[in-house]
Amino acid sequence: RTVAAPSVFIFPPSDEQLKSGTASVVCLLNNFYPREAKVQWKVDNALQSGNSQESVTEQDSKDSTYSLSSTLTLSKADYEKHKVYACEVTHQGLSSPVTKSFNRGEC
Amino acid sequence: ASTKGPSVFPLAPSSKSTSGGTAALGCLVKDYFPEPVTVSWNSGALTSGVHTFPAVLQSSGLYSLSSVVTVPSSSLGTQTYICNVNHKPSNTKVDKKVEPKSC
């Protein structure tokens, strides 16, 4: 099939989870092809390594695309030390990397 | 690790998870053991646009996964989206309502 760029979404940790002392930030890459995609996490513009995990779906039987979730996991204390959370996505279907971000505590 | 039921947290739709006419929302199913869990949406009445990702094994020895669904953004304020999580090994069933974050 032809190249399909991912749709990228970012989710902050829920208030429920923060009450438990942990913060998971999720970046979703939806319906892309080919499978190769790179996700980089940045916290206050500092590149993160070693504290995220990725999971990729099987190839979709209808449109042959893939989807990927990347989860950045931090302690609540670490999460609350920083403001800007961003996932940067690189993929063949994107002319330049796409960044989705949010400011902690803001809608 | 001994048997442990998951915690289920909402991945709430917001302007950061909306693109044009599409909104994404989901559930984070975290810290369970052993595999597997099953996730459905609206008791199986919503299947189109659903992606339930393979579980990942965390450093804690517990599993975690996310299930997400894309929906028309126009539907967010008019109906309820619920993820139904079942972890048979711990006899845990959780129905989590996922709503737009109220600011």
């Epitope: 749709s7 319906n31 209808k62 | 919503l46 189109s48 894309t70 028309p72 539907s75 008019t78």
Partner: antibody, heavy 110, light 110 residues
Framework: QSLEESGGRLVTPGTPLTLTCTAS????????MNWVRQAPGKGLEWIGT?????SAAYASWAKGRFTISRTSTTVDLKAASPTTEDTATYFC???????WGPGTLVTVSS | DVVMTQTPASVSEPVGGTVTIKCQAS??????LAWYQQKPGQPPKLLIY???TLESGVPSRFKGSGSGTEFTLTISDLECADAATYYC????????????FGGGTKVEIK
Amino acid sequence: QSLEESGGRLVTPGTPLTLTCTASGFSLSTYWMNWVRQAPGKGLEWIGTINIDGSAAYASWAKGRFTISRTSTTVDLKAASPTTEDTATYFCATYGGDIWGPGTLVTVSS
Amino acid sequence: DVVMTQTPASVSEPVGGTVTIKCQASQSISTALAWYQQKPGQPPKLLIYGASTLESGVPSRFKGSGSGTEFTLTISDLECADAATYYCQCTYYGNNYGNAFGGGTKVEIK
């Protein structure tokens, strides 16, 4: 932001027909889209919906009679073997109903 | 598919009067209901979505209410420009619901 349907014409029964919906001022690719029709002097009739990954849902009466598909820039409605009962104005619209095309007239007659 | 039953089929009221249109869904659709106004030769125009939320630019004389299976559109202080046919539509997103329209209500202004 607007939609426009094209492809409506006079056809004989059984002649395959494809209608196309295109958008101006916004990208169709992130929108669920509906096809709706209206026979002369009659009410609105939902045909089906296509979601962003190309999966379509149809009214029970439309299954097997119509096929909805999409590209990155268009949404198509195909009638494989139209009958005289399919004579109508066909509209495409966003799922939320806030944007409609003006409609395109299909006349099926021998 | 959800079936939408709309009543009455037609109604005639004087300028300044009030019209009430009812729409019943065959199963619960929460507040996933839209109301449209359509004039001859034009596509439908969205008036209300989410059962009660007024679309931008629509006068507050139009009021939607209801949830579950029973819905109402009320038009007060009728004006000549309100002469049109009004439709309800199920906008619930999920398997086997569909986005059916009610049969329409023709509103005439005396």
